[in-house]
Amino acid sequence: KFSKQSWGLENEALIVRCPRQGKPSYTVDWYYSQTNKSIPTQERNRVFASGQLLKFLPAAVADSGIYTCIVRSPTFNRTGYANVTIYKKQSDCNVPDYLMYSTVSGSEKNSKIYCPTIDLYNWTAPLEWFKNCQALQGSRYRAHKSFLVIDNVMTEDAGDYTCKFIHNENGANYSVTATRSFTVKDEQGFSLFPVIGAPAQNEIKEVEIGKNANLTCSACFGKGTQFLAAVLWQLNGTKITDFGEPRIQQEEGQNQSFSNGLACLDMVLRIADVKEEDLLLQYDCLALNLHGLRRHTVRLSRKNPIDHHS
């Protein structure tokens, strides 16, 4: 339950907050879960703990893994888990789904796009904003504090927006980028019984033991902005948050995309360090809205190594 997905790019700063909260005066100990090795608090280290925050300055792909934080309140030791994934920088412009933060919707009256996670960093204005990798220019775009305001929003303003800022730590500067999709509300919409595009019903997904696996639940719900539409994953009929396996997490926030004018939602299920017991679980992709609920079931199977028989 007290587990949080965090992700970043190599050579950028990444700061992660312990999912268990406490007063600033409380001691927080951080450990690398796989080895139970304590994370140092000395700032001279590239990866160090600072109270409730775990800082990667800068992050490296090898930092990926599950980190344990223990908040020592006067009464209890509260444990949380930060599931950190550091990705290699993409050479092309496309920002993959797994690097996207939750989608925001805007309309003519309200078109604020907040820069995700920025509150964790020591940054100074102004932010730089990009849309589909192009720097935003023109009087319609205004970078204000930690958000972007777009004047006279049009349908064409939908897309992926990236904020870029500099985190300063003891005089050293580190770059941070974060991307989220922006959709424009369409008043002339309609809603349908959910249609799950992926996975196929009773799909068998091959995975490798010890590797990471991603399952994407993707469904469409109609045209335009949808109310009360959601996609989610269940394990053996239980919500991911209640299942209690920190290695298995849903992507934070749902990515909204418009396919042929349809409003669709994705939810990525990330399984870290696939284990044998994961093959025994039933993975259900659920899509629901006011019309009802549709469920597609997936099971995992072990990917067989390629035979080298003559």
Epitope: K1, F2, Q21, G22, K23, P74, F76, R78
Partner: antibody, heavy 121, light 106 residues
């Protein structure tokens, strides 16, 4: 809104046990620890112990250790405090209070209405 | 255990008066919380983290202090402020309260 509703008044004989319930609503039960405080007639407030409903972990005031049991039922969002080997000095109002201490601190902002326990032969 | 000594144990003041209650801890604490309790009612949190005003509490109530010495103040006493006031520390186990200060209106 956050509400803590406690069970009704109890009259017990010395040596018996009493179990007081505290039903929570208006927030995610497992997100906050539940604390128990008692107040003898005309006296001050005395902390008895606490439970983390998420994990079932408990912490007690040494004074009550061995006599008090705290449990939490996640399915009904209810916390329980059981005090055994009752004596006359356990006559008091027993309160549950929610404790969630973070930057937007609302620890001990919400209290149950209290349960009067009378121990008398 | 950290002992909390509140003073005075009782006091009587007039409407409009400035009232101060002190709480001394037997060893240093990070924060002090203050509660108001009226007969037959559960305690009501007024001040938390030494000086932060709880939601919906009038601004005439305030708190200050650090280390072992803390102060609770009512800047202008109102008739509805007649009650017993408690300080409480939550810096170490067990959580402890002061013995209370009974405030009467003259």
């Amino acid at each position: 809104q956050v509400q803590l509703v406690q069970s009704g008044a109890e009259v017990k004989k010395p040596g018996a046990s009493v179990k007081v319930s505290c039903k929570a609503s208006g927030y995610t039960f497992t997100d906050s620890e539940m604390y128990w405080v008692r107040q003898a007639p005309g006296q001050g407030l005395e902390w008895m112990g606490a439970i983390d409903p998420e994990t079932g972990d408990t912490a007690f005031n040494q004074k009550f250790k061995g006599r008090v049991t705290m449990t939490a039922d996640k399915s009904t969002s209810t916390a329980y405090m059981e005090l055994s080997s009752l004596r006359s000095e356990d006559t008091a109002v027993y309160y549950c209070t929610r404790a969630f201490d973070n930057d937007n601190d609302d620890a001990f902002a919400y209290w149950g209405q209290g349960t009067m326990v009378t121990v008398s032969s | 255990d950290i002992q909390m000594t509140q003073s005075p144990s009782s006091l009587s003041a007039s409407v409009g008066d400035r009232v101060t209650i002190t709480c001394s801890a037997s060893s240093s604490v990070n924060y002090m919380h203050w509660y108001q309790q009226k007969p037959g009612k559960a305690p009501k949190r007024l001040i938390y983290d030494t000086s932060k005003l709880a939601s919906g509490v009038p601004s005439r109530f305030s708190g200050s202090g650090s280390g072992t010495d803390y102060t609770f103040t009512i800047s202008s006493l109102q008739p509805e402020d007649a009650a017993t006031y408690y300080c409480q520390q939550w810096s170490s186990n067990p959580l402890t309260f002061g013995q209370g200060t009974k405030l009467e209106i003259k």
